[in-house]
């Protein structure tokens, strides 16, 4: 019950994450203009990661794309890459977790095909929200160093006798959006690895194989091994299973960390 | 269609308030800002200051201690208020609806009060 | 607050003629983020409010005659009537629209030789 529980909850906080992260990326208010020391203008001016607005006192809103691609900074770029990969990963995660939900029957999946699942879809949701904080982190990043940098032009470049209103640039809404939704994901995705280990059965009861030894009929019914959940030191042990001898690295494969990159 | 009238005393003795109404149709205030401008007679246009749609308002800096500006959404009207006048602040008062580019694309027929005592 | 220099003050010109005047702010009206100009000119015939005729900078207002233009950036602007009619015997103002508080110039008045 408890495992079924926690895996629900990494689900919802995940989809929740996933969502925030979706939000995040398509909103406009990436880095928003710095008020504060600044001369009270009667426009304001804000960016995302695909278009810049302009939203004048009189009510009037005009955003215009970056059509261009080349012509972008890389770190924007990059950001923009972070977050959707961010959001395709955790996409095919919540995909993947569906299916791995306890409370879900999909025709006779095994108990520990849906921990793999679960363990898959965690992991996936662990790099998700990485690739949404590591994104909007390089953001504020540049936003800070630009800000230092247009701070020092403004107290530097008054040589002459006209002045030039700096725009600033300070963190926007979305960022704080991206990091909460990044470590929803991110917390959503270590809740469904935990469930993974309680979803792997505890004991695993074969079906009872004879062994005929001459002159005697004695039946021999193995006790079964704990179940490796690829946390457990047990990961070695041959078992006869269905008359078939397999090592349990055939029977569940774990994603490695290659897997994710 | 857009239309601003503002209707004021015509006469004010000095050291006394200003009030005067702009009433405002074909928009709404709780989405656009209206705009007051003053001008004495033969002189040039003075921007006295400005009630956007969120409230927000910005007055002119030598006037900034005596002015005030409100506005009452439901009414579709909004207040002036001049205090402590004196003779040069005789004018024609006009309140004017900002548009794009923060410029102001319509414009009452202005009121002229007199300060004199 | 932002000082709005207006030249002339007033000009005596003739019909169909092509007049020109300028308009100088103390600090830039350009707004980095859509690479706009707040500055606005604004037509005032005798005894009539002010009628809007070109914001940005350049944009004409819909219904102001193409005679009408305007040009510039940053502090220098320029208001241009391509052929002087009767009818635009009026004084010409601009307005600072980017920083408040937003300053009118003193306004350039053109009359009839």
């Known amino acids: 019950m408890a495992v079924t529980a926690c895996q629900g909850l990494g689900f919802v906080v995940s989809l929740i994450g996933i969502a925030g992260i979706i939000a995040a990326t398509c909103m406009d208010q990436w880095s928003t203009q710095d008020l504060y020391n600044n001369p009270v203008t009667a426009v304001f001016n804000y960016q995302g990661l695909w278009r810049s607005c302009v939203r004048e006192s009189s009510g009037f809103t005009e955003c215009r794309g970056y059509f261009t691609l080349l012509g972008l900074p890389a770190m924007l770029q990059a950001v923009r890459a972070l977050m959707i990969v961010g959001i395709v990963l955790g996409a095919i995660g919540l995909l993947v977790s569906i299916f791995a939900l306890k409370c879900i029957r999909i025709g006779s999946m095994e108990d520990s095909a849906k921990a793999n699942m679960t363990l898959t879809s965690g992991i996936m949701f662990i790099v998700s929200g990485l690739c949404a904080i590591a994104g909007v982190s390089v953001f504020a990043n540049m936003l800070v160093t630009n800000f230092w940098m247009s701070t020092a032009n403004m107290y530097t470049g008054m040589g002459g006798m006209v002045q030039t209103v700096q725009t600033r640039y300070t963190f926007g809404a979305a960022l704080f959006v991206g990091w909460v939704a990044g470590g929803l994901t991110l917390i959503g995705g270590v809740m469904m690895c935990i469930a993974c280990r309680g979803l792997a059965p505890e004991e695993t009861n074969y079906k009872a194989v004879s062994y005929h030894a001459s002159g005697h009929s004695v039946a021999y019914k193995p006790g079964g091994f704990k179940a490796s959940t690829g946390f457990g030191s047990n990961t070695k042990n041959k078992k006869i299973y269905d008359g078939g001898a397999r090592t349990e690295d055939e029977v569940q494969s774990y994603p490695s960390k290659h897997d994710y990159v | 269609q857009v239309q601003l009238k503002e209707s004021g005393p015509g006469l004010v003795a000095p050291s006394q308030s200003l009030s005067i109404t702009c009433t405002v149709s074909?928009?709404?205030?709780?989405?656009?800002?209206v705009s007051w401008v003053r001008q004495p007679p033969g002189k040039g246009l003075e921007w006295l200051g400005v009630?956007?749609?969120?409230?927000?308002?910005h007055y002119h800096s030598a006037l900034i201690s005596r002015l005030s500006i409100r506005k009452d959404n439901s009414k579709s009207q909004v207040f002036l208020k001049l205090n402590s006048l004196q003779t040069d602040d005789t004018a024609t008062y006009y309140c004017?609806?900002?548009?794009?580019?923060?410029?102001?694309?319509?414009w009452g027929q202005g009121t002229s009060v007199t300060v004199s005592s | 607050d932002i000082v709005m220099s207006q030249s002339p003050s007033s000009l005596t010109v003739t019909a169909g003629e092509k007049v020109t005047m300028s308009c100088k702010s103390s600090?830039?009206?350009?707004?980095?983020?859509?690479?706009?100009?707040?500055l606005t000119w604004y037509q005032q015939k005798p005894g009539q409010s002010p009628k809007l005729l070109i914001y940005?900078?350049?944009t004409r207002e819909s219904g102001v005659p193409d005679r009408f233009t305007g040009s510039g950036s940053g502090t220098d602007f320029t208001l241009t009537i391509s052929s002087m009619q009767a009818e635009d015997l009026a004084v010409y103002y601009c307005?600072?629209?980017?920083?408040?508080?937003?300053?009118f110039g003193a306004g350039t008045m053109l009359e009839l030789k």
């Open positions: 004017a609806k900002p548009g794009r580019g923060n410029a102001m694309d319509y």
């Open positions: 074909g928009f709404a205030l709780t989405t656009y800002g």
């Open positions: 009630i956007w749609g969120d409230g927000s308002t």
């Open positions: 600090q830039s009206l350009l707004n980095s983020g859509n690479q706009k100009n707040y």
């Open positions: 940005w900078a350049s």
């Open positions: 307005q600072n629209d980017y920083i408040y508080p937003l300053t």
